[in-house]
Amino acid sequence: PEPPTACREKQYLINSQCCSLCQPGQKLVSDCTEFTETECLPCGESEFLDTWNRETHCHQHKYCDPNLGLRVQQKGTSETDTICTCEEGWHCTSEACESCVLHRSCSPGFGVKQIATGVSDTICEPCPVGFFSNVSSAFEKCHPWTSCETKDLVVQQAGTNKTDVVCGPQDRLRA
């Protein structure tokens, strides 16, 4: 018979014959021959292959490097890679999440508009007139200036975007 030029799914062509690919979780040890089947071996501990393959080496599971703010979300198997995610208080630097960075804080004069998530950073906004923030924080919104009037006091020092107003007693009119 004519040697094949193409093989079925889950097969590969070698030495003019079709050999079975190794299943996910296994690597190729030796190609099939006219008389023997393809020889495959399971991937070792901390290794994987996720497709039908003819790889002679398994891939190492991804390392979720804590120095990059990563932790294991899902442990890898012989057929799947480890999935990493960000530590609490960190967010991914891209959709692929190959590393994480600490959430940014909003500087004094700015408040948190949107608290960070595992995939997005803190969104800050400038404190508008009537509001202030005197801390660097990843959680605090701008606070409204104290209302001196409701405390029966007067403004002794005007507020800014970084400082609250300072209230003081009203001057008593002398008789």
């Epitope: 080496h57 891939h59 991804k62 890679d81 630097t93 891209s94 692929a96 190959e98 960075v101």
Partner: antibody, heavy 113, light 108 residues
Framework: VKESEGGLFKPTDTLTLTCTVS????????VSWVRQAPGNGLEWIGG???????YYASWAKSRATITRDTNLKTVTLEMTSLTAADTATYFC??????????WGPGTLVTVSS | AFELTQTPSPVSAAVGGTVTIKCQAS??????LAWYQQKPGQPPKVLIV???NLASGVSSRFKGSGSGTEFTLSISDLECADGATYYC??????????FGGGTEVVVK
Amino acid sequence: VKESEGGLFKPTDTLTLTCTVSGFSLSSYGVSWVRQAPGNGLEWIGGIGSDGSAYYASWAKSRATITRDTNLKTVTLEMTSLTAADTATYFCARGGITVYAIWGPGTLVTVSS
Amino acid sequence: AFELTQTPSPVSAAVGGTVTIKCQASQSISNGLAWYQQKPGQPPKVLIVGASNLASGVSSRFKGSGSGTEFTLSISDLECADGATYYCQSYFSSSSTVFGGGTEVVVK
């Protein structure tokens, strides 16, 4: 990771370099391209994430295209409209938007008429 | 456009001494900064990740610090082998992935 051979190119040519990876899957790790002109510093060109998203430096957006073939385990950089300023050693490194712990040896690209 | 500015260059010190290299970001990048060492004819080698964490297998003589926009790499007990060019790199986001201009360290 290892870059394909560079070589001599003429101005206006298109550069195509291939980075071949082994020991890891392109579905697990991204690959980036960095270049270094003779006697100069490192310059990030762009990268492709493990999810297939491509990212580019602002200067490279209009000229560079980065693609991958997960089966062939290759990542390709194509750069159009070459000038003498593109003469550099081109490196590929493992990782998209991240730290680059594994680098290829680099390949020299010379652009001259 | 986002920039990383490294100072000074070059910097020189005697064997056993200490050098400090600064890297300034044009906007806050939190702790998304790495430091690399590069010797002629070789690719860069990562030293510090996350602004202050020592990369695997790197000597504790290398120390990174800083966050936000100001970062520092210090090399203590200088050895001849530390003579190289050092680069900072931001990886905070795709729009701020960039290398600093490099600082040459000369060990006398």
